[in-house]
């Protein structure tokens, strides 16, 4: 369960890949599209509101082997829209929704080497937001391998 209904903290940051490509959001035909692209020098990076929540549960209840606290995050690039995992389509989408947010909008935050982070689906442990063909997608990571694969590493910068 997520401790409390309000985040412990929030921050505005731009999101980029391990290879320094920017994550951008564009309104097209009344819906938002997510792109992974090289930004022109003078173009301003899109900012995302990251809301951080504490999740507290015993491993027996969660089934993910974690027996304590985890840091959950939701990502909102524009008012009332949140990144959500579509596990059926293995895609990451922007949806307009009201609070309380659905579980698909929550991601477990992992700190990684090189000051990178990864985002693991709350609804599907072992599945992370990643980069595939210049788009964000859901990528299954084999826990027997090192989780350092570059396509699931992101950088946050204020």
């Amino acid at each position: 369960s997520i401790t409390g209904i309000s985040p412990i903290t929030e921050s505005l940051a731009s999101l980029s890949t391990y290879n320094d490509q920017s994550i951008t959001f564009a309104l097209e035909d009344e819906s938002y599209e997510i792109y992974v692209e090289d930004l022109k020098k003078d173009k301003k990076k899109d900012k995302v509101l990251l809301s951080y929540y504490e999740s507290q549960h015993p491993s027996s209840e969660s089934g993910d082997g974690v027996d304590g606290k985890m840091l959950m995050v939701t990502l909102s690039p524009t008012k009332d829209f949140w990144l959500q995992a579509n596990n059926k389509e293995h895609s990451v989408e922007l949806h307009k929704c009201e609070k309380p947010l659905p579980d698909q909008a929550f991601f477990v935050l992992h700190n990684r080497s090189f000051n990178c982070v990864s985002f693991e689906c709350k609804t599907d442990p072992g599945v992370f937001i990643g980069v595939k063909d210049n788009h964000l997608a859901l990528i299954k990571v084999d826990y027997s391998e090192n989780l350092g694969s570059e396509n699931i590493l992101f950088k946050l910068s204020e």
Partner: antibody
Framework: QVQLVQSGAEVKKPGASVKVSCKAS????????MHWVRQAPGQGLEWMGE????????SYAQKFQGRVTMTRDTSTSTVYMELSSLRSEDTAVYYC???????????????WGRGTLVTVSS | DIQMTQSPSSVSASVGDRVTITCRAS??????LAWYQQKPGKAPKLLIY???SLQSGVPSRFSGSGSGTDFTLTISSLQPEDFATYYC?????????FGGGTKVEIK
């Protein structure tokens, strides 16, 4: 309950190496990174580095790069910190510490070992 | 590396006093700041995380505030067991770095 048990005090000569162990219990070992922090006598706290017990990846403070090696043994839930080419300035208490949150160091370090005193003296 | 500057380095106070310790980061660290208490011969103890969240089991007389680069730890009414050294630590990026410490002594 969750605890970190460290190996005993060591006395080493300059130029030698020391290997300190930290045995974890009471939690899922691979879900939490392990950090090493040292404290010289009468001084403040100094972060040395971190190991991710899941894959074994490490991040070291620049100051210790090339002299420190952090490893782990998942079968015994033990993390090791080896410091080589010891000098008198390395005399300190060495702590292992676990983050408050699984997978993340953002919420601070809430479980600490009791510390291992390493004395470097000729 | 991010430098953490703590002040004052020591403070003399009496039981019941309000004590404030400040910590300044050389660059923005979002809200990722922790405060620790350390007593002689003991390991540090986490008091506050994410700038203002109280660690479980820590008395409510301890509070944290601030964001960006400037943070504060306040002890609203000092108790005998609070005489110790306090450290701030940025948890935003590697290498994690600590402030130099503030020793709270009996007046």
């Amino acid at each position: 309950q969750v605890q970190l048990v460290q190996s005993g005090a060591e006395v080493k000569k300059p130029g030698a190496s020391v290997k300190v162990s930290c045995k974890a219990s009471g939690y899922t070992f691979i879900s939490y990174g392990m950090h090493w922090v040292r404290q010289a006598p009468g001084q403040g706290l100094e972060w040395m580095g971190e190991i991710n017990p899941h894959g074994g990846s490490t991040s070291y403070a620049q100051k210790f790069q090339g002299r420190v090696t952090m490893t782990r043994d998942t079968s015994t839930s033990t993390v090791y910190m080896e410091l080589s080419s010891l000098r008198s300035e390395d005399t300190a208490v060495y702590y292992c510490a676990r983050p408050s949150a699984a997978y993340s160091h953002y919420l601070g370090l809430d479980i600490w070992g009791r510390g291992t005193l390493v004395t470097v003296s000729s | 590396d991010i430098q953490m500057t703590q002040s004052p380095s020591s403070v003399s106070a009496s039981v019941g006093d309000r004590v404030t310790i400040t910590c300044r980061a050389s660059q923005g660290i979002s809200p990722w700041l922790a405060w620790y208490q350390q007593k002689p011969g003991k390991a540090p103890k986490l008091l506050i995380y994410a700038g203002s969240s109280l660690q479980s089991g820590v008395p409510s007389r301890f509070s944290g505030s601030g964001s960006g680069t400037d943070f504060t730890l306040t002890i609203s009414s000092l108790q005998p067991e609070d005489f110790a050294t306090y450290y701030c630590q940025q948890a935003n990026v590697f290498p994690l770095t600590f402030g130099g410490g503030t020793k709270v002594e009996i007046k």
